[in-house]
């Protein structure tokens, strides 16, 4: 029951996380700038991974997509790649984990197969979460670096002059959404990996079937193991070959895929 709950919770947490990663990737507010020194109107500028927008105090808003790949900073391309890889891995992980859920029966799928699928999806979620966290962190670092570099960026050309406008660079909402979503996906992945351990069927202590002779306390052990009578030193029918860890009666009290005669 605890395993099913852990697996189910891991799936839900990962699902929320991946939805958050998708939302963050699509959002326009990765970074924002307030242009206080604008001589005409208050301008609020914000950028995403795919387009840049401007909003003026008059209410005018305009967004333009980055239609060229050549003019974009390599870091921005890297962030895009990390977020997309995170989404793809997360989506595949979700697909795999749906079939791995203990509460869903698909044909005669064995517990071992479900355990493997749970582990696979868990690892995918972990990598997906790490990709998202890495992507958001790289972008945040790029903003901080740009803020400090902007004071020294000025050059002249063709009689005119180009200089960086001093703006207040702030982290956009998408960065926080991305960090939280990445964290949730990571936690969900860890939960799936933990659930996998509980799903894996425990190795049975013996490979043979016990046959009890009627009327006698004798257990035949096919495959060359010692047979024991109900007398002498092995009165509790302890399995001789495994160091006497459990009695046969104790072992039989656990459900197993082996039939008992």
């Amino acid at each position: 029951m605890a395993v099913t709950a852990c697996q189910g919770l891991g799936f839900v947490v990962s699902l929320i996380g991946i939805a958050g990663i998708i939302a963050a990737t699509c959002m326009d507010q990765w970074s924002t700038q307030d242009l206080y020194n604008n001589p005409v109107t208050a301008v609020f500028n914000y950028q995403g991974l795919w387009r840049s927008c401007v909003r003026e105090s008059s209410g005018f808003t305009e967004c333009r997509g980055y239609f060229t790949l050549l003019g974009l900073p390599a870091m921005l391309q890297a962030v895009r790649a990390l977020m997309i890889v995170g989404i793809v891995l997360g989506a595949i992980g979700l697909l795999v984990s749906i079939f791995a859920l203990k509460c869903i029966r698909i044909g005669s799928m064995e517990d071992s197969a479900k355990a493997n699928m749970t582990l696979t999806s868990g690892i995918m979620f972990i990598v997906s979460g790490l990709c998202a966290i890495a992507g958001v962190s790289v972008f945040a670092n790029m903003l901080v670096t740009n803020f400090w570099m902007s004071t020294a960026n000025m050059y002249t050309g063709m009689g005119g002059m180009v200089q960086t406008v001093q703006t207040r660079y702030t982290f956009g909402a998408a960065l926080f959404v991305g960090w939280v979503a990445g964290g949730l996906t990571l936690i969900g992945g860890v939960m799936m990996c933990i659930a996998c351990r509980g799903l894996a069927p425990e190795e049975t202590n013996y490979k043979a079937v016990s046959y009890h002779a009627s009327g006698h306390s004798v257990a035949y052990k096919p495959g060359g193991f010692k047979a024991s009578t109900g007398f002498g030193s092995n009165t509790k029918n302890k399995k001789i070959y495994d160091g006497g860890a459990r009695t046969e009666d104790e072992v039989q009290s656990y459900p197993s895929k082996h039939d008992y005669v």
Partner: nanobody
Framework: EVQLVESGGGLVQPGGSLRLSCAAS????????MVWYRQAPGKQRELVAG???????NYAHSVKGRFTISRDNAKNTMYLQMNSLKSEDTATYYC???????????????WGQGTLVTVSA
């Protein structure tokens, strides 16, 4: 590299008219605000008129009602229609633009080299 090129300046008689143009060229993603400044000999540079991307305008008190600023966003060009010119309008007129540059993820302030307007009889 982003460049602003002013044109349309020259000698004009008092009461006359001139139309200045400022064209932005180069690898620029989006120009948001465009402004005309002027600097008379021995004086501080002052704002004449400005226009935002959305069309919001701002004029200096001394030119209100005489000058009209406009722009073409598609062509990244700004215009200043100057009517009823006075001798005190004599100055070098500079074009200024605040532009968003995706290549550096920064706002850039670009200045033109200026065009001389002389109002004299």
């Amino acid at each position: 590299e982003v460049q602003l090129v002013e044109s349309g300046g020259g000698l004009v008689q008092p009461g006359g008219s001139l139309r200045l143009s400022c064209a932005a060229s180069g690898n620029i993603f989006r120009i948001d605000t465009m402004v005309w400044y002027r600097q008379a000999p021995g004086k501080q540079r002052e704002l004449v008129a400005g226009i935002s991307r959305g069309g919001t305008t701002n004029y200096a008190h001394s030119v209100k009602g005489r000058f009209t600023i406009s722009r073409d966003n598609a062509k990244n060009t700004m215009y200043l229609q100057m009517n009823s010119l006075k001798s005190e309008d004599t100055a070098t007129y500079y074009c200024n633009a605040q532009a968003w540059d995706v290549g550096t993820i920064r706002y850039l302030e670009v200045w033109g080299q200026g065009t001389l307007v002389t109002v004299s009889a």
